[in-house]
């Protein structure tokens, strides 16, 4: 029987009974948070052979081996992964061995086995026989191998029963437990699976089979399962489902979901039965099972039950992620927040249409409304008292509505209202009237000319740059000295700059009133000499990178209740010079004949310009005499070389650091201090562990029901 779509067993070990009749778990299997040590010996699920997603074990007290629970688990497909992993064993306090002696294939994803204080038989498993690539495996913080004394079956009696393979230059027996070898197929089978009797399975089988060369006798399928047969692709009029089987249209149409989007059911797209159309596609009609490409961003209609959606935090904005049409009214009331402008853009930036009104009040954290970067239509089907469909009241730091040179916004019905926005220039409001087609709708009191913009320098003069000079990591710019009517009103200049790969940035990008700003800022004092033009040297820049730069004059904003003129420049785009590229990455060389070497590499992470060619240099090296110095047939004469495995746990390094032999006659000496690169790698490693642990906790801990 197929079970699914993912099974979560927690708190009570008796929930394991849910696995009783499962042969395939279509989805994941979580076994976690069972804090009372139980006797699991009476629980055995020999029917279970395949998990299509991943297996996660976390804090299950009393469980000592998985072999008794899942003696026939053969394949974990990894169709969906848990943080890139198909097998996660984390903080299993009593687990002594993994013991999944029939596990032959993890189709996709890596394994993470971490913080299992009692877990042994890890170095005796050759994961390369199970996974395609072992480089992403993370096996850290388990019982130190020295304390394990792992012995494979028959080793003590000097009648070893298991086969040997090489891992990290160590040729050794491979087993899961003290009495279970790791199964290996004859080399004649190549990539194919094999039976218990070492006969090769059909090429479409994965993991194992009950009879040789028979596509109906597979334990699991390499590609897809359909009507009892393993097939390379789904037959006509059937569709891939969950990455492992073929289903017909009727099956797909009859899948019921508990997701909020289920009103329309599953779809068929690109030969697959899936829950929703993929990114960039939309259903071809509301009850259709088929997808067509969207023109531009895909429409997503979002509706608020209470008609008015209040955006007072990032969390409330999150509910609108992906929405393009909002049915209802938006009330924006953002008083504080961290990195608020870019967060709001992330969650509300796709909204194109609001059917009701938009009201922005007491939003002291906002400097601009540019986070609504795709808003093009306010229908005004519902209006505020007084027939307002755009209402902006008491926003202490609001300076810009939108960049009207690049913005088309129509307000179909209703008026606009603006009051008590001290940094919002009236000229900006008048410009909005023109663009939105609301000019003439507003009465005199709707746009208050006294309390809008009274704390801003609204009539801006333009500062002109006079010179720019660049090097690989510096830009020198100068600009005309600004002369307001009264020179005492000019305090200083502020230069704003940031990386800008494209020439599409605006002054208010990523800026909010709570300190977040995507621009770097530098203050420039007035030159004491009146004839010298002000300027700045921007240093520490990246080579061959385009920067956007603009300058603002810092002026006194009030002179006896008159608005005074400010000044700022246009945004200037300027690219630093090219420089030497960083080194090419991942250089690998291999010989494919007695006279040829194949060398491969990846481009440098920092090209610092346009790469035009690579220079490859090589030279002949003398043979290493070290190879001839020892009699390799005499076991005790082989020099002991330690190979770093890159995952040394701090607590596992117990040797005295003064025991390394430094070669020659020097005798013992201290371990070398860690290089900056090693320290950085250790720091990143610790950070990576933390990130994973946070992900794990966030994924599996859910609040208790009330």
């Amino acid at each position: 029987e197929i079970c699914g779509p993912g099974i979560d067993i927690r708190n009570d070990y008796q929930q394991l009974k849910r696995l009783e009749n499962c042969t395939v778990i279509e989805g994941y299997l979580h076994i976690l948070l069972i804090s009372k040590a139980e006797d699991y010996r009476s629980y055995r699920f020999p029917k279970l052979t395949v998990i299509t997603e991943y297996l996660l074990l976390f804090r299950v007290a009393g469980l000592e081996s998985l072999g008794d629970l899942f003696p026939n688990l053969t394949v974990i497909r990894g169709w969906k992964l848990f943080y890139n992993y198909a097998l996660v064993i984390f903080e299993m306090t009593n687990l002594k061995d993994i013991g999944l002696y029939n596990l032959r294939n993890i189709t996709r994803g890596a394994i993470r086995i971490e913080k299992n204080a009692d877990l042994c038989y890890l170095s005796t498993v050759d994961w390369s026989l199970i996974l395609d690539a072992v480089s992403n495996n993370y096996i850290v913080g388990n019982k130190p191998p020295k304390e394990c004394g792992d012995l494979c079956p028959g080793t003590m009696e000097e009648k070893p029963m298991c086969e040997k393979t090489t891992i990290n230059n160590e040729y050794n027996y491979r087993c899961w437990t003290t009495n279970r070898c790791q199964k290996m197929c004859p080399s004649t089978c190549g990539k194919r699976a094999c039976t218990e009797n070492n006969e090769c399975c059909h090429p479409e089988c994965l993991g194992s089979c009950s009879a040789p060369d028979n596509d109906t006798a597979c334990v699991a399928c390499r590609h897809y399962y359909y009507a009892g047969v393993c097939v390379p692709a789904c037959p006509p009029n059937t569709y891939r489902f969950e990455g492992w089987r073929c289903v017909d249209r009727d099956f797909c149409a009859n899948i019921l979901s508990a997701e909020s989007s289920d009103s329309e059911g599953f779809v068929i797209h690109d030969g697959e039965c899936m829950q929703e159309c993929p990114s960039g596609f939309i259903r071809n009609g509301s009850q259709s099972m088929y997808c067509i490409p969207c023109e531009g961003p895909c429409p997503k209609v979002c509706e608020e039950e209470k008609k008015t959606k209040t955006i007072d935090s990032v969390t409330s904005a999150q509910m609108l992620q992906g929405c393009t049409i909002f049915k209802g009214n938006l009330l924006i009331n953002i008083r504080r927040g961290n990195n608020i402008a870019s967060e709001l853009e992330n969650f509300m930036g796709l909204i194109e249409v609001v059917t009701g009104y938009v009201k922005i009040r007491h939003s002291h954290a906002l400097v601009s409304l540019s986070f609504l970067k795709n808003l093009r239509l306010i229908l005004g089907e519902e209006q505020l008292e007084g027939n307002y469909s755009f209402y902006v009241l008491d926003n202490q730091n609001l300076q810009q509505l939108w960049d009207w040179d690049h913005r088309n916004l129509t307000i179909k019905a209703g008026k606009m209202y603006f009051a008590f926005n001290p940094k919002l220039c009236v000229s900006e409001i008048y410009r909005m009237e023109e663009v939105t087609g609301t000019k003439g709708r507003q009465s005199k009191g709707d746009i208050n000319t006294r309390n809008n913009g009274e704390r801003a320098s609204c009539e801006s003069d333009v500062l002109h740059f006079t010179s720019t000079t660049t090097s690989k990591n510096r830009i020198i710019i100068t600009w005309h000295r600004y002369r307001p009517p009264d020179y005492r009103d000019l305090i200083s200049f502020t230069v704003y700059y940031k990386e800008a790969p494209f020439k599409n940035v605006t002054e208010y990008d990523g800026q909010d009133a709570c300190g977040s700003n995507s621009w770097n800022m530098v203050d420039v004092d007035l030159p004491p000499n009146k004839d010298v033009e002000p300027g700045i040297l921007l240093h520490g820049l990246k080579p061959w990178t385009q920067y956007a730069v603009y300058v603002k004059a810092v002026t006194l904003t009030m002179v006896e209740n008159d608005h005074i003129r400010g000044a700022k420049s246009e945004i200037l785009y300027i690219r630093t010079n090219a420089s030497v590229p960083s080194i090419p990455l991942d250089v690998l060389s291999a010989s494919n004949s007695s006279s040829q070497l194949i060398v491969k590499w990846n481009p440098p992470s920092l090209p610092n310009g346009n790469l035009s060619y690579y220079i490859v240099r090589w030279q002949r090296q003398p043979q290493d005499g070290y190879l001839y110095r020892h009699n390799y047939c005499s076991k005790d004469k082989i020099p002991i070389r330690k190979y770093a495995d890159g995952t040394i746990d701090i607590e596992e390094v117990t040797e005295n650091p003064k025991t390394e032999v430094c070669g020659g006659e020097k005798g013992p000496c201290c371990a070398c201090p860690k290089t900056e690169a090693e320290k950085q790698a250790e720091k990143e490693e610790a950070e990576y562990r933390k990130v994973f642990e946070n992900f794990l906790h966030n994924s599996i801990f859910v609040p208790r029901p009330e």
């Epitope: 029987e1 197929i2 079970c3 699914g4 779509p5 993912g6 099974i7 979560d8 849910r18 009749n21 499962c22 279509e26 009727d250 099956f251 009859n254 899948i255 019921l256 979901s257 508990a258 997701e259 909020s260 289920d262 009103s263 059911g265 829950q275 029901p705």
Partner: nanobody
Framework: EVQLVESGGGLVQPGGSLRLSCAAS????????MSWFRQAPGKEREFVSA????????RYADSVKGRFTISRDNSKNTLYLQMNSLRAEDTAVYYC????????????????WGQGTLVTVSS
């Protein structure tokens, strides 16, 4: 953990009607696909009907199509089965079942089950 309790079973004459209820507690009710299964004496358990989390989509076994109606009230955490035109072959213990996220047409192993309520159709 989800607890399911069925009610509404009883003795009814052929052609009569009955309404079964299933009260759920323990987790967000709307995040489960809900189903009715039944088991007649000496027979295998069989699927009767299922409903999506929002209550907008349903599925019925051919044997009950047009006679039974499944519904749910997410505000009351309750699943219903309205059974009309009852026949003798509808006699069985009716079980309510819940599965998180989704349910495929071939799914028999639901995550959570009720204890069942007996429906007897007899003259």
């Amino acid at each position: 953990e989800v607890q399911l309790v069925e009610s509404g079973g009883g003795l009814v004459q052929p052609g009569g009607s009955l309404r079964l209820s299933c009260a759920a507690s323990g987790r967000t009710f709307s995040s489960f696909v809900m189903s009715w299964f039944r088991q007649a004496p000496g027979k295998e358990r069989e699927f009767v009907s299922a409903i999506s989390g929002s209550g907008s989509r349903f599925r019925y076994a051919d044997s009950v199509k047009g006679r039974f109606t499944i519904s749910r009230d997410n505000s009351k955490n309750t699943l219903y089965l309205q059974m009309n035109s009852l026949r003798a072959e509808d006699t069985a213990v009716y079980y309510c079942a819940a599965n998180p996220r989704r349910a495929t047409p071939d799914l028999q192993q639901y995550a959570y089950w009720g204890q069942g309520t007996l429906v007897t159709v007899s003259s």
